[in-house]
Amino acid sequence: GCLTQLYENAFFRGGDVASMYTPNAQYCQMRCTFHPRCLLFSFLPASSINDMEKRFGCFLKDSVTGTLPKVHRTGAVSGHSLKQCGHQISACHRDIYKGVDMRGVNFNVSKVSSVEECQKRCTSNIRCQFFSYATQTFHKAEYRNNCLLKYSPGGTPTAIKVLSNVESGFSLKPCALSEIGCHMNIFQHLAFSDVDVARVLTPDAFVCRTICTYHPNCLFFTFYTNVWKIESQRNVCLLKTSESGTPSSSTPQENTISGYSLLTCKRTLPEPCHSKIYPGVDFGGEELNVTFVKGVNVCQETCTKMIRCQFFTYSLLPEDCKEEKCKCFLRLSMDGSPTRIAYGTQGSSGYSLRLCNTGDNSVCTTKTSTRIVGGTNSSWGEWPWQVSLQVKLTAQRHLCGGSLIGHQWVLTAAHCFDGLPLQDVWRIYSGILNLSDITKDTPFSQIKEIIIHQNYKVSEGNHDIALIKLQAPLNYTEFQKPICLPSKGDTSTIYTNCWVTGWGFSKEKGEIQNILQKVNIPLVTNEECQKRYQDYKITQRMVCAGYKEGGKDACKGDSGGPLVCKHNGMWRLVGITSWGEGCARREQPGVYTKVAEYMDWILEKTQSSDGKAQMQSPA
């Protein structure tokens, strides 16, 4: 299953399959997730080690048993790959690292006014993988405001150095935010020239294209079909690059197929997995396990559940079958692709779905109409769980926020439905940033069921929580995916990086905002919060957030939206925007429904009709 916990001051001994430099443990975890054999990782921050060569070291590890012995190492961080973690699987990494220079091949230098602008340039440059930016206060005047675009053979820095007044980060192309755009065309009977960066075996050009998309240096590819004239080159997928970023030449060639990486696509990237099953095809590789199962789909499920399994072959040979069950061969290789592909067999083959980010049909967990004041504009895909709850009576208007917590579930505030309990009048928009982008043709979800907490009373602040079941499940994308829920009664975690988002008023007597706003707000203890509210009881089912001096807060129209906190690289839904005394007033924190206190209720209500909980726990 999915394991998200991180181990502080621990290092996994042995099992190394690769090593690289990464700026933090989360990026190291992401590289582990996308490495075909990595199950575990250990990361050495700069503070944890004196050896300059090992600082920022990210060590990817495999283990036949799925675990390795942990040794104590002060400052080290270890953890698991996020394979099998559904919507948490993403190659997108937005963080900017201050005081860090990520080294690589510098291929472009320009002057820009901010690190965000530098990141944007990197994202809009086809070859840029990461960047460094020298700030206004950099010690050498001539380098100030320099934006260095970089690449490296492995897509990760060749070294990382601590350097004052330098900020570094990665391209946001994996976040589907590139302005370049992409070529979706597949060119039959055409071979591209240029430099081969890798060679793998694939059953078709589409798998080849997906592998190219997620390979750090692949810009385009050529695939040789199973009827290619040279037998040893059949099913070969050549991943390619060039100085210019496009093929310098192409040659008409029978039984070849060429195309481009889809990494530069805007708004949609292919899933990093291959779900198709190939009848009459055998995939060769190292044997992991053989099991008797009923049908090829069950074989694929078995492979997906066995975390080290990369691909499988389901044999229909009479000698491989007993009654209705046949042999399911679970296999793996060094690069995640078959070592041999044979056609015209009595088998069916396919890949593990461990990297599919749709996951199962579940919601993600781990072990006064209020109100964003003092916020800033959000960017695409920054808060992919945020939804807009709109009411269509004569006109249509945004009324509340909400959080996507599963394919078919939204969590919001009960008070959003005060006086409007009819499900037919509501429209739920997900995967949007600007309300002005909504037209009559914009797809929306309708409500199948509104479940208001049984103890909620209209115009009271208690038990301000409601679940919405959507009529149809939503697919997950970089812009539309769920937020993880906290564990039940989560009281031990100290959250220091919390954000509130919404389209609500930007001042107490204001109006709904067009662009989704975000504001970083510190949590306030319930004891402190209680002292600020002379007349209202702040219960253990509430959480407060706000600045002593005010100025930043949620406001009217943000109700029901998320208060999310990032902990160990993972966002969790800590609160639901509920109520407050005005907006952003001095010494009046916002009050949020504490989600951890309602986990039993959420789990109970999201049970599927067959009695299975529609929740998965990555913990």
């Epitope: 009271e460 208690n462 209680q530 002292k531 600020r532 509210y533 002379q534 209202y536 009881k537």
Partner: antibody, heavy 116, light 106 residues
């Protein structure tokens, strides 16, 4: 309309006990805190204790600890305060109040006189 | 525990006068001070909380200020209906009242 009505005040002998009631209307007591405060004759105000009726969590002034026991019945929206080992020093008007961070609304008070 | 020293204990003023009452805390109370008005035979009424925030429905002639350990309560223009005893209350650490200030008309 929010209302708090105290009752149970009486003349009691030193060493005796008494149970005061605080009946709430216009709100549910489990949605607030109930406080007890007393005022000795021609003297200032003194906080006694507080209850969260939802979970029966109580807090008392350390100086009065043991003298008073506060309870609540959410089914009748009534809070109680049991006073024991009474002395003449406990002669006072006893108020119940509701609120969050402090006492926002008060009852009219009930007089307890301790005398032989 | 925190002690609250309120002064004066009593004062006389004319209608329209500015009236000032002070309260000194034995420790820093982080601005968690409230002011109550009590008329004879009645229960106290909350006027101000968190040093300077006016409880809803309270006239704006009442105000509060201060920080740390020193706090002031002011009636900008005394009205006949303001004749009462005023108490400060710290609620930073449990609850402690001041001794009260009786305000009378000259």
């Amino acid at each position: 309309e929010v209302q708090l009505v105290e009752s149970g005040g009486a003349l009691v002998k030193p060493g005796g006990s008494l149970r005061l009631s605080c009946a709430a209307s216009g709100f549910n007591i489990k949605d607030t805190y109930i406080f007890w405060v007393r005022q000795m004759p021609r003297k200032g105000l003194e906080w006694i204790g507080r209850i969260d009726p939802e979970n029966d969590n109580t807090k008392y002034d350390p100086k009065i600890q043991g003298k008073a026991t506060i309870t609540a019945d959410t089914s009748t929206d009534t809070a109680y305060m049991e006073l024991s080992s009474l002395t003449s020093e406990d002669t006072a008007v006893y108020y119940c109040a509701k609120g969050g961070g402090l006492f926002a609304y008060w009852g009219q008070g009930t007089l307890v006189t301790v005398s032989s | 525990d925190i002690q609250m020293t309120q002064s004066p204990s009593a004062m006389s003023a004319s209608v329209g006068d500015r009236v000032t009452i002070t309260c000194e805390a034995s420790h820093d109370i982080n601005n968690y001070i409230a002011w109550y008005q009590q008329k004879p035979g009645k229960a106290p009424k909350l006027l101000i909380y968190y040093t300077s925030t006016l409880q809803s429905g309270v006239p704006s002639r009442f105000s509060g200020s201060g920080s740390g350990t020193d706090f002031t309560f002011t009636i900008s223009s005394l009205q006949p209906e303001d004749i009462a005893t005023y108490y400060c209350l710290q609620y930073d650490n449990l609850f402690t009242f001041g001794q009260g200030t009786k305000v009378e008309i000259k």
